[in-house]
């Protein structure tokens, strides 16, 4: 999987969208690693 900063941000955006935003506030691109996906 792509692990560049931009890929990580887009993946997290998709995850947040699918979860309806019901995710911990600190679940943000700069402090989640690729393993979080």
């Amino acid at each position: 999987a792509c692990d560049t900063a931009t890929c990580v941000t887009h993946r997290l955006a998709g995850l947040l969208s699918r979860s309806g935003g019901v995710v911990k506030n600190n679940f943000v691109p700069t402090n989640v690693g690729s393993k979080a996906f």
């Epitope: 931009t6 890929c7 941000t9 887009h10 947040l16 691109p29 700069t30």
Partner: antibody
Framework: EVQLVQSGAEVKKPGASVKVSCKAS????????MNWVRQAPGQRLEWMGV????????TYNRKFKGRVTITVDKSASTAYMELSSLRSEDTAVYYC????????????WGQGTTVTVSS | DIQMTQSPSSLSASVGDRVTITCKAS??????VAWYQQKPGKSPKALIY???YRYSGVPSRFSGSGSGTDFTLTISSLQPEDVATYHC?????????FGQGTKLEIK
């Protein structure tokens, strides 16, 4: 309102260094990566590097061979790009850019900073 | 580094025309491609991410497609305000790389 506001135009002599700032507002600065991109006259956009403001880790375009340094001041929500050993080919518009999810899912760019390298 | 080759480098079309710009990557970049619009003297503006997804606020006449090495930006009905240079970018690998740009003019 999300804004990335960059420092003003610079004129530098060959061999000098330049440091461009990018002040972020309207979002949590440490939550999102900050990229630096430049555009020389008549040339394609060129990615220089990215910083994670949360842990200050950086990734650079190896084309710049150690001439570029990206830093942040978290307390001032400001990112900096320093380019050293300037040459005429470094004459370009330099942009900071950050892809955000909140408050809006969008790729925001600063207004650009013109750096002219001339003897 | 991944080379992004855009074509054409410039084109002229009439208001209402369907316009297609292509971008070819030198190796597989999945769908990790973005498209930007840049008007003279302005910063690039994001249009498309992940090859085919429009950012909020981008008019529906703009669409993107493709995967692997071949990507397309289409403007379904050209408007006067679409006069700009369009750039593709791959972000699958570091360093991110851009196409050389396509300058779009109105006939």
């Amino acid at each position: 309102e999300v804004q990335l506001v960059q420092s003003g135009a610079e004129v530098k002599k060959p061999g000098a260094s330049v440091k461009v700032s990018c002040k972020a507002s309207g979002y949590t600065f440490t939550d999102y990566y900050m990229n630096w991109v430049r555009q020389a006259p008549g040339q394609r956009l060129e990615w220089m590097g990215v910083i994670n403001p949360y842990n200050v880790r950086t990734t650079y375009n190896r084309k710049f061979k150690g001439r570029v340094t990206i830093t942040v001041d978290k307390s001032a929500s400001t990112a900096y790009m320093e380019l050293s050993s300037l040459r005429s080919e470094d004459t370009a518009v330099y942009y900071c850019a950050s892809l955000l999810i909140r408050p809006h899912y969008f790729d925001y760019w600063g207004q650009g900073t013109t750096v002219t390298v001339s003897s | 580094d991944i080379q992004m080759t855009q074509s054409p480098s410039s084109l002229s079309a009439s208001v209402g025309d369907r316009v297609t710009i292509t971008c070819k990557a030198s190796q597989n970049v999945g769908t990790n491609v973005a498209w930007y619009q840049q008007k003279p003297g302005k910063s690039p503006k994001a249009l498309i991410y992940s090859a085919s997804y429009r950012y909020s606020g981008v008019p529906s006449r703009f669409s993107g497609s493709g995967s692997g090495t071949d990507f397309t930006l289409t403007i379904s009905s050209l408007q006067p305000e679409d006069v700009a240079t369009y750039h593709c970018q791959q972000y699958n690998f570091y360093p991110y790389t851009f196409g050389q740009g396509t300058k779009l003019e109105i006939k």
